[in-house]
Interface confidence: low
Amino acid sequence: VPSIPLDVLSASNSSSQLIVKWNPPSLPNGNLSYYIVRWQRQPQDGYLYRHNYCSKDKIPIRKYADGTIDIEEVTENPKTEVCGGEKGPCCACPKTEAEKQAEKEEAEYRKVFENFLHNSIFVPRPERKRRDVMQVANTTMSSRSRNTTAADTYNITDPEELETEYPFFESRVDNKERTVISNLRPFTLYRIDIHSCNHEAEKLGCSASNFVFARTMPAEGADDIPGPVTWEPRPENSIFLKWPEPENPNGLILMYEIKYGSQVEDQRECVSRQEYRKYGGAKLNRLNPGNYTARIQATSLSGNGSWTDPVFFYVQAKTGYENFIH
């Protein structure tokens, strides 16, 4: 049996392809015949599903041309947060020691997360759910579990979050040390394994694998919301907006932003992934009577999609005595 292929590397030139290149094994132990290339889609980090990206005015924004994202504090038009019940806008709640510690850890995580997106060769994930250790090339890497505050995370089970083992796909590569893997999902992480096989492969099998993690590039338009935005009137001067989610987004959708207003679209509402998954849309509350327009934009791991076409809706004035006392 030959030794493992050397120097496996991968790069992406499109949202659906990964190019893989390697060097022959140092010990072919006979005539090298072919290589087996196997690839497997990797689940997203559970943290990305559970974190509420609308909390504490943090929104991921596209910051770098290479598609890495950061989470920034928003100072203009901050989204109001409810302090102790639904009593309308109020000042920011004082931070507890636990929250301060969580923010410190959040900053650490952001650095790791930025690196995670920046490197085409994957750095081990900062958090694992069901595995405390991960064997990487005979090295055990343990990872510290992160403490997060309840305000930042959800316990809602996202069907996509369950760390399913995606199937491996396989192809045979003859007489060369490079290949192109196609039909992949955009901005998605894959594990690619390469096995060396010599003339005795059928009898003795092939080598153990050398592997690499690589991410496909983001796809243009993949984060755009398909189809129309619709609305339904609700009691108490509110309406419910519904929209379909992008079918094959860049990685996953972290949040949605609604821009709405009666004269100009000067109000903003952030809708977390978890809220959207629960309700299929979002409720806009405490609207003054009148005609409104709204647009919606999704934010994925790689940045923002396009704003939707405007949806027009109206809030009726209450009539009669009821209107008089208001």
Epitope: L6, A11, K21, I121, R172, D174, K176, T179
Partner: antibody, heavy 118, light 112 residues
Framework: EVQLVESGPGLVKPSGTLSLTCAVS?????????WSWVRQPPGKGLEWIGE???????NYNPSLKSRVTISVDKSKNQFSLKLSSVTAADTAVYYC???????????WGQGTTVTVSS | DVVMTQSPLSLPVTPGEPASISCRSS???????????LDWYLQKPGQSPQLLIY???NRASGVPDRFSGSGSGTDFTLKISRVEAEDVGVYYC?????????FGQGTKVEIK
């Protein structure tokens, strides 16, 4: 934007060793690329000399393999070419290039002329 | 080793007219994944080579769409739909299927 700059002596004596360095700026030599050397004798075509990955793995042109050494210095973000036992036939413009995997050699240095003469 | 052969070696062109360069490899550059491991480069007078086409038919970043690559297996063609004065120089094909990487001998394109 990645840029490559070749440097080294422009004149080498026959039977001596040609030594060139390619400085990588605007990017890391440890990124997922191979780094190549290509040469072009006066009035002739391009000839691939060899390539190196940041781990130190190399591939060489068999026609030059016995005389060529390509090395990498990650701390200086550069890679180097050494060609021993040179003759007048090694007189050429030497280019370093980034071999962006199968996307081709998408970044090239400006080239440096090396003359082998006594 | 793979040997690359280009023709013609010299190509006088008229601005605004199309031009075509042929490249032949001594063995197939078509991999079982369906991609042809062939690149095209242009070296303008006094300059370093620049990448035009990779994987047989994919235009590199910033390359005008008047350049196109086609072909499969052992026979490849670079076409310029309408030659412009800035397109003069030497065009090289290169096989990237296996090491040693190998260039064709070059085709010199000049204005008539």
């Amino acid at each position: 934007e990645v840029q490559l700059v070749e440097s080294g002596p422009g004149l080498v004596k026959p039977s001596g060793t040609l030594s060139l360095t390619c400085a990588v700026s605007g990017g890391s030599i440890s990124s997922s690329n191979w780094w190549s050397w290509v040469r072009q004798p006066p009035g002739k075509g391009l000839e691939w000399i060899g390539e190196i990955y940041h781990s130190g793995s190399t591939n060489y042109n068999p026609s030059l393999k016995s005389r060529v050494t390509i090395s990498v210095d990650k701390s200086k973000n550069q890679f180097s070419l050494k060609l021993s036992s040179v003759t007048a036939a090694d007189t050429a413009v030497y280019y370093c290039a980034r071999d962006y995997d199968i996307f081709g050699m998408d970044v090239w240095g400006q080239g440096t002329t090396v003359t082998v003469s006594s | 080793d793979v040997v690359m052969t280009q023709s013609p070696l010299s190509l006088p062109v008229t601005p605004g007219e199309p031009a075509s360069i042929s490249c032949r490899s001594s063995q197939s550059l078509l991999h079982s994944n369906g991609y042809n491991y062939l690149d095209w480069y242009l070296q303008k007078p006094g300059q370093s080579p620049q990448l035009l086409i990779y994987l047989g038919s994919n235009r590199a970043s910033g390359v005008p769409d008047r350049f196109s690559g086609s072909g499969s297996g052992t026979d490849f063609t670079l076409k310029i739909s309408r030659v412009e004065a800035e397109d003069v120089g030497v065009y090289y094909c290169m096989q990237a299927l296996q090491t040693p990487l190998a260039f064709g001998q070059g085709t010199k394109v000049e204005i008539k």
